[in-house]
């Protein structure tokens, strides 16, 4: 019961996490900044992985997609890749874990197969969560690095004077959504891996016994009890018939014509 609960909870937590990773990837608010230092209008800029948006004090908002791939920073491309890999792995993990759920019966699927599928999906969730956390962290680092590099340096070029305005771009909501979602997916994956241990076929709680034919009437008691003859009492609990019952550990490797399996 505990195994089913752990597996089910792991699945739900991972599902929420992957939904969060998808949401974060699609969100525009990865970085945000108020640009008040102009005489026309107060401007609020926010940027995502796919487009940059500007919202004015009037409420007007314009978003422009990053249509060029060549002009984009390599770090942004890396973040995109990490998030997409995280989503793909998570989606496959979800698909696998649905069939692995103990509460769902599909044909005559063995517990060992479900255990393997649970472990596979768990590992996928862990990698998916790590990808999301890594992607969000790389983007956050990019924002911090950009701030320290843009120390209001002014330079003159073909088009006149260009001034890099040093203003701090703050972490957008998408970063926090991504971190939390990645963490949840990671936790869900760990739970699935833990559940896998409980799903694996359990060893029998008694040792298998091999029987040897004998002329005596021998009472065989599995579970480690010594076999005793039906004649008289064995008050001192001595080993009366050594050739009778043996545990698998004690059985010799060479075959015997008297052995019964």
């Amino acid at each position: 019961m505990a195994v089913t609960a752990c597996q089910g909870l792991g699945f739900v937590v991972s599902l929420i996490g992957i939904a969060g990773i998808i949401a974060a990837t699609c969100m525009d608010q990865w970085s945000t900044q108020d640009l008040y230092n102009n005489p026309v209008t107060a401007v609020f800029n926010y940027q995502g992985l796919w487009r940059s948006c500007v919202r004015e004090s009037s409420g007007f908002t314009e978003c422009r997609g990053y249509f060029t791939l060549l002009g984009l920073p390599a770090m942004l491309q890396a973040v995109r890749a990490l998030m997409i890999v995280g989503i793909v792995l998570g989606a496959i993990g979800l698909l696998v874990s649905i069939f692995a759920l103990k509460c769902i019966r599909i044909g005559s699927m063995e517990d060992s197969a479900k255990a393997n599928m649970t472990l596979t999906s768990g590992i996928m969730f862990i990698v998916s969560g790590l990808c999301a956390i890594a992607g969000v962290s790389v983007f956050a680092n990019m924002l911090v690095t950009n701030f320290w590099m843009s120390t209001a340096n002014m330079y003159t070029g073909m088009g006149g004077m260009v001034q890099t305005v040093q203003t701090r771009y703050t972490f957008g909501a998408a970063l926090f959504v991504g971190w939390v979602a990645g963490g949840l997916t990671l936790i869900g994956g760990v739970m699935m891996c833990i559940a896998c241990r409980g799903l694996a076929p359990e060893e029998t709680n008694y040792k298998a016994v091999s029987y040897h034919a004998s002329g005596h009437s021998v009472a065989y008691k599995p579970g480690g009890f010594k076999a005793s003859t039906g004649f008289g009492s064995n008050t001192k609990n001595k080993k009366i018939y050594d050739g009778g019952a043996r545990t698998e550990d004690e059985v010799q490797s060479y075959p015997s014509k008297h052995d019964y399996v």
């Epitope: 900044q33 640009l35 209008t41 500007v54 004015e56 009037s58 007007f60 314009e62 942004l76 924002l143």
Partner: nanobody, 119 residues
């Protein structure tokens, strides 16, 4: 790198008209604000007119009713239509744009200036 190309300046008689244009090119994500400033000899640089992406405009007191600013967002270009020009409008006119040029960075870019002489 972001470049600005200004054009349209020149010599005009009082009461005449001129149209200035300024096109931005380079790595541009958004241009929230585009505008024109001017600097007459011996004076400080002052705002002539500015326009946001959404069309919000702001004009300097001395040009209200005479100058009209407009922009083409698709072409990243701003225009300044100057009517009823006066000798005191003589100055170097500078294009100014606020450009979102990358992730977590924006630039304030100034053009090299175009001279407008009203005489």
């Amino acid at each position: 790198q972001v470049q600005l190309v200004e054009s349209g300046g020149g010599l005009v008689q009082p009461g005449g008209s001129l149209r200035l244009s300024c096109a931005a090119s380079g790595t541009i994500f958004n241009i929230p604000v585009m505008g024109w400033y001017r600097q007459a000899p011996g004076k400080q640089r002052e705002l002539v007119a500015g326009i946001s992406t959404g069309g919000t405009t702001n004009y300097g007191d001395s040009v209200k009713g005479r100058f009209t600013i407009s922009r083409d967002n698709a072409k990243n270009t701003v225009y300044l239509q100057m009517n009823s020009l006066k000798p005191e409008d003589t100055a170097v006119y500078y294009c100014n744009v606020l450009v979102i040029s990358g992730i977590g960075s924006h630039l304030e870019v100034w053009g090299q200036g175009t001279l407008v002489t009203v005489s």
